[in-house]
């Protein structure tokens, strides 16, 4: 148990969120971090992976309603598979119906998250800020 | 100790955030919630108080850097004191210099928070969405 060093007691009226990497946003037991530095999609993915996280996966408007108020455009983990014409997440799962409105501003196989559950198609090599996410167990 | 019912162990590499009211956003041990319903400033303040919270107080660009990405306009706990012409928070503390850029779009004694640490002056009776905040101890 050497990895564990804190013991906390939690009031019934309130709850702790996490665990998350230090100084990440915790919401409904998911962890989020917004990164300011602009990277292409692949570099953004690598950055998230290096922190035991992945690029943002949108799976629920209810559990992730904090995302509707996010300003600007940020890489998320959604990629286009040209051979079968599908948008899917890094983990291989298909985009769930009615979650995102995909807007094709230009040709590309990666997608930027924008407020109100919109996804903007972008060339994967274009530098952008990005959102990492870690789902707690 | 009847109010406490959970005991959790936290890995050193990660940390829990809070405690916060259930389903609030937790960031750097502060709790935030964005409310969709439009209320005037006084109703917004009452709503936050009923949840043992206050309207948003901006006290640190570093500790509250998640606020820079907030879209739209929301009541915060900043009010204008006509007698001395200062802007102060609900708790009576004066607005620290260089924290917010105050923009006088119209006459008013209340302020809306907008992204990138801007405050828009607004009539206190105008309905707007609002942000509640609870600082953890």
């Amino acid at each position: 148990n050497s990895l564990f060093n804190q013991e906390v007691q939690i009031p019934l009226t309130e709850s702790y969120c996490g665990p998350c990497p230090k100084n990440w946003i915790c919401y409904k037991n998911n962890c989020y971090q917004f990164f300011d530095e602009s990277k292409n999609w692949y570099e953004s993915q690598a950055s998230c992976m290096s922190q035991n996280a992945s690029l943002l996966k949108v799976y629920s408007k209810e559990d992730q309603d904090l995302l509707k108020l996010v300003k600007s455009y940020h890489w998320m983990g959604l990629v286009h598979i040209p051979t079968n014409g599908s948008w899917q997440w890094e983990d291989g799962s298909i985009l769930s119906p009615n979650l995102l409105t995909i807007i094709e501003m230009q040709k590309g196989d990666c997608a930027l998250y924008a407020s109100s559950f919109k996804g903007y198609i972008e060339n994967c090599s274009t530098p952008n800020t990005y959102i990492c996410m870690q789902r707690t167990v | 100790n009847s109010l406490f019912n959970q005991e959790v162990q936290i890995p050193l590499t990660e940390s829990y955030c809070g405690p916060c009211p259930k389903n609030w956003i937790c960031y750097k041990n502060n709790c935030y919630q964005f409310f969709d319903e439009s209320k005037n400033w006084y109703e917004s303040q009452a709503s936050c108080m009923s949840q043992n919270a206050s309207l948003l107080k901006v006290y640190s660009k570093e500790d509250q850097d998640l606020l820079k990405l907030v879209k739209s306009y929301h009541w915060m706990g900043l009010v204008h004191i006509p007698t001395n012409g200062s802007w102060q928070w609900e708790d009576g503390s004066i607005l620290s210099p260089n924290l917010l850029t105050i923009i006088e779009m119209q006459k008013g004694d209340c302020a809306l928070y907008a992204s990138s640490f801007k405050g828009y002056i607004e009539n206190c009776s105008t309905p707007n969405t609002y942000i509640c905040m609870q600082r953890t101890v």
């Epitope: 040209p82 014409g85 599908s86 985009l95 769930s96 119906p97 009615n98 094709e104 | -």
Partner: antibody
């Protein structure tokens, strides 16, 4: 086995309306993009409209924009095409088609047998 | 809109022949090209997608190649059931467009 079955075609006067339906089975309807493609007698194929529930998008050929509306009922696994202000040049066999993925970039993987729409006075 | 021009529009060939149909796009479409076969009174059938991928269940005598603006469909050895009309289709951008078709008839 994937099946697409169109219905609702027939004879209609210019300016009239028709609603085509495409009942589907054998796949998870809501996960796939669907299109309507038409073929005028003795002519080639013309794409009409596209709908993807997953990616929240819809599009139309210029020739039908503002007159035709594509929709779907995922609970009934059915695709629809509401056709208003019909013209003689809309006369064609209308095919319902399933894309191979959830976006229009996927090829037309499966086709229905078609339903004939005739616009004539 | 992206125009697709197929050539030839009409082709007469014999069983056992090697046949090539070309499809030229008015602008680059990467590999977003599919080929379909249609027989009279029937719905089209997907043969090739992503320019060169063979659809499951389609005989290996059919093959596709190309990228960008120039694409080809090749039938290595014509069989009697291959006599039909063939269409190329691009899905690089909407509106989705088809070539005008190539009618393949028995010589």
């Amino acid at each position: 086995e994937v099946q697409l079955l169109e219905s609702g075609g027939g004879l209609v006067q210019p300016g009239g309306s028709l609603r085509l339906s495409c009942a589907t089975s054998g796949f998870t309807f809501s996960d796939y993009a669907m299109s309507w493609v038409r073929q005028a007698p003795g002519k080639g194929l013309e794409w009409v409209s596209y709908n993807s529930f997953s990616v929240g998008s819809t599009d139309y050929a210029d020739s039908v924009k503002g007159r035709f509306t594509i929709s779907r009922d995922n609970s009934k696994n059915t695709l629809y095409l509401q056709m208003n202000s019909l013209r003689a040049e809309d006369t064609a066999v209308y095919y319902c088609s399933k894309h191979s993925g959830n976006y229009y970039t996927g090829p037309f993987h499966y086709w229905g047998q078609g339903t004939l729409v005739t616009v004539s006075s | 809109d992206i125009q697709l021009t197929q050539s030839p529009s009409f082709l007469s060939a014999s069983v056992g022949d090697r046949v090539t149909i070309t499809c030229r796009a008015s602008q680059g479409i990467s590999s977003y090209l599919a080929w379909y076969q249609q027989k009279p009174g029937k719905a089209p059938k997907l043969l090739i997608y992503a320019a060169s991928s063979l659809e499951s269940g389609v005989p290996s005598r059919f093959s596709g190649s190309g990228s960008g603006t120039d694409f080809t469909l090749t039938i290595s050895s014509l069989q009697p059931e291959d006599f039909a009309t063939y269409y190329c289709q691009q899905s690089y951008s909407t509106p989705i467009t088809f070539g005008q078709g190539t009618r393949l008839e028995i010589k």
